[in-house]
Interface confidence: low
C-alpha cells in the first residue's frame, strides 16, 4: 500500500456571506486506520470544525457517506457562512491509538476568504467632443470586490489597448476594493460607430469577465467638407447651385445661403443621407434668378456644425451671354 497523502485541492476558497462553503479533502490510502478530523488554524489553539465520531456541528455536513466502506472522501460543507468563518482549514488524519488517537498527517490547508464580485464597470468618456487625430480619455470604475487581485483590460472595437493607467484602492487590507482606470484613445475619422470596452476579470466571476462600454459617437466630432458647384444647365433665368456638405458628425448642422453678401431667407431643397461609417452628408440646392444684364453673382454656402465656428464656400457666377466656367474658392 502506498504512503498516505492528504489532498486538499483548493489553496483558496472564496465564499459569500450566507452561502455554503465546500472544503474538499481526499486521501490516497485507507491506512493507517483512524479518523479524519477538520481544524481551523494550526497549533495548540486550533479550532475543531468537524469530528464524525463525537461533538455537535450543526452547520457542518459531509459530502460523502463517511460510513461507506473504503470511503476516501472527507470533504465537508459549512452552511450560513459569516465573516467569523474565514481562516485556513486543515483536514488531519489520526492513527488509532490507545489511550487516544495520534495525529498522523495533515493536508496542506485551504484558506477560506470572503469573496465579493466587482460591480459592473461604468465607462465614462470626455465631457466635450473632439475631432479625429486627437486623443481622448475614458475612465472605467468598478467597486466592492474582494480579494484585491483583479485584471482590467481596455479594447477598442475588439483590439486591446495599451495606453492606460489603473489604480486599485485602498492599498492596504480592506473588506472591499475599488478599481479605476483611465485609457487614452486616439480618435479616427471612422470612429463614429466604434466602441471602447473596459473588461474586468476577478476570481469571483468564475471566468466570465464583466464589461462596460462607451460609444465613441459620444466623444467624436467629424467636421464637414464643403463643395459648391453650379449645375451646367440653365432653365430660363434660373441657375441651380448645389452645396454638398460631406462626412460630418454629429447631425447638428445649420446651412445658410448668401447672395452677394445678403443672407437669403427663401426655402431651399435639401437631403440628408447617412454614410456606412455613421457620418452624414447634406446636400442643399439653391436656385438663382439671373438676367443677362445683371452683375456677377457671388453665392456663399455657410455651415455651422455642432456649435463650432462657421465654415463657408463660395461660388462666383459670371453671368454673361456666353456663360463662362464656374470658379470656386474657399473662405475661412
Amino acid at each position: 500500500e502506498e504512503e498516505l497523502q492528504m489532498i486538499q485541492p483548493e489553496k483558496l476558497l472564496l465564499v459569500t456571506v450566507g452561502k455554503t462553503a465546500t472544503l474538499h479533502c481526499t486521501v490516497t490510502s485507507l491506512l493507517p486506520v483512524g479518523p479524519v478530523l477538520w481544524f481551523r488554524g494550526v497549533g495548540p489553539g486550533r479550532e475543531l470544525i468537524y469530528n464524525q465520531k463525537e461533538g455537535h456541528f450543526p452547520r457542518v455536513t459531509t459530502v460523502s457517506d463517511l460510513t461507506k466502506r473504503n470511503n476516501m472522501d472527507f470533504s465537508i460543507r459549512i452552511s450560513s457562512i459569516t465573516p467569523a468563518d474565514v481562516g485556513t482549514y486543515y483536514c488531519v488524519k489520526f492513527r488509532k491509538g490507545s489511550p487516544e488517537n495520534v495525529e498522523f498527517k495533515s493536508g496542506p490547508g485551504t484558506e477560506m476568504a470572503l469573496g465579493a464580485k466587482p460591480s459592473a464597470p461604468v465607462v465614462l468618456g470626455p465631457a466635450a467632443r473632439t475631432t479625429p487625430e486627437h486623443t481622448v480619455s475614458f475612465t472605467c470604475e468598478s467597486h466592492g470586490f474582494s480579494p484585491r487581485d483583479i485584471t482590467l483590460k481596455w479594447f477598442k472595437n475588439g483590439n486591446e489597448l495599451s495606453d492606460f493607467q489603473t489604480n486599485v484602492d485602498p492599498t492596504g487590507q480592506s473588506v472591499a476594493y475599488s478599481i479605476r482606470s483611465t485609457a487614452r484613445v486616439v480618435l479616427d475619422p471612422w470612429d463614429v460607430r466604434s466602441q471602447v470596452i473596459c473588461e474586468v476579470a476577478h476570481v469571483t466571476l468564475q471566468g466570465d469577465p464583466l464589461r462596460g462600454t462607451a460609444n465613441l459617437s459620444e466623444a467624436i466630432r467629424v467636421p464637414p467638407t464643403l463643395e459648391v458647384t453650379q449645375q451646367p444647365m440653365r432653365v430660363g433665368n434660373q441657375v441651380n447651385v448645389t452645396c454638398q456638405v460631406r462626412k460630418f458628425y454629429p447631425q447638428s448642422l445649420q446651412l445658410t445661403w448668401s447672395e452677394n453678401g445678403n443672407v437669403c431667407q427663401r426655402e431651399t431643397a435639401s437631403t440628408l443621407t447617412e454614410n456606412k461609417d455613421g457620418t452624414y452628408n447634406w446636400t442643399s440646392w439653391f436656385l438663382v434668378n439671373i438676367s443677362d444684364q445683371r452683375d456677377d453673382v457671388v453665392l456663399t454656402c455657410q455651415v455651422k456644425h455642432d456649435g463650432q465656428l462657421a465654415v463657408s464656400k463660395r461660388l462666383a457666377l459670371e453671368v454673361t451671354v456666353h456663360q463662362k466656367d464656374q470658379s470656386s474658392d474657399a473662405t475661412p
Partner: antibody, heavy 114, light 108 residues
C-alpha cells in the same frame, strides 16, 4: 495491479455516433471520480468530461457539451462516453483516467472521417 | 473557462536543474497536477496536490506554487526525463478541468 482499459474506438463518419467504454480493475472503482481526456494527433491533452463517484455530478468541456454524455456503472466497474454528432475535430486518442488522473488507460483511437 | 499557459519548449543540460512553469488564474485557487508523456505512450502523473509524488516517481521531481503560477522542477535531469510535460487543474469555476498546452523538454 491498478488498470484502466478503454475500448470502443474506431472509424466513424461525421455526424455519426460511438460509445467508448473503460473497464477498471485493481482498485475500488466507486471511491473515485473519473475523467475522459483526449489527444488529437500531434496535439496536447484536452479534458473532455468528468463524473463523480456516484454519477451525481458531471462536467463537460465546451467543445463537446450537448453532444457527449459521460456515465458509469459501479456494479460493473465501468466508465462510458457516449459520443453523438461526431465531427472531424473529435478525431483523437481518448484516455480514461482516474479524476486526479493518477491512473490512465492506454487510450483508444477515434477517427472521424468521410 | 480558464486557460493554463506553458512554454512550448525548454532544454536542460544533463544533470542540471530545470523548471517548467504553468500560469493561469485557476492556479490562485487550485493546485496543479503535472504529467509526463513520452512518444506513443499514455501520460504519467508525476506531481499532484501541494507537492505529492506518486510511488515510483523519482524524488528529483518536485512541485511548487505561488500566486497564479505552478512550477515543476527536475533537479539533476536525466536523459529519460526527455518528454512532453503537461499541467492541469480545475478551472476557475471548479466544475471543469483544464490542461496547459504542454512543454517539450529536451535533455542535452
Amino acid at each position: 495491479e491498478v488498470q484502466l482499459v478503454e475500448s470502443g474506438g474506431g472509424v466513424v463518419r461525421p455526424g455519426g455516433s460511438l460509445r467508448l467504454s473503460c473497464a477498471a480493475s485493481g482498485f475500488t472503482f466507486d471511491d473515485y471520480g473519473m475523467s475522459w481526456v483526449r489527444q488529437a494527433p500531434g496535439k496536447g491533452l484536452e479534458w473532455v468530461s468528468g463524473i463523480n463517484w456516484n454519477g451525481g455530478s458531471t462536467g463537460y468541456a465546451d467543445s463537446v457539451k450537448g453532444r457527449f454524455t459521460i456515465s458509469r456503472d459501479n456494479a460493473k466497474n465501468s466508465l462510458y462516453l457516449q459520443m453523438n454528432s461526431l465531427r472531424a475535430e473529435d478525431t483523437a486518442v481518448y484516455y480514461c483516467a482516474r479524476w486526479i488522473a493518477k491512473v490512465w488507460g492506454q487510450g483508444t483511437l477515434v477517427t472521424v472521417s468521410r | 473557462s480558464s486557460e493554463l499557459t506553458q512554454d512550448p519548449a525548454v532544454s536542460v543540460a544533463l544533470g542540471q536543474t530545470v523548471r517548467i512553469t504553468c500560469q493561469g488564474d485557476s492556479l490562485r485557487s487550485y493546485y496543479a497536477s503535472w504529467y509526463q508523456q513520452k512518444p506513443g505512450q499514455a501520460p504519467v502523473l508525476v506531481i499532484y496536490g501541494k507537492n505529492n509524488r506518486p510511488s515510483g516517481i523519482p524524488d528529483r521531481f518536485s512541485g511548487s506554487s505561488s500566486g497564479n503560477t505552478a512550477s515543476l522542477t527536475i533537479t539533476g535531469a536525466q536523459a529519460e526525463d526527455e518528454a512532453d510535460y503537461y499541467c492541469n487543474s480545475r478551472d476557475s469555476s471548479g466544475n471543469h478541468v483544464v490542461f496547459g498546452g504542454g512543454t517539450k523538454l529536451t535533455v542535452l
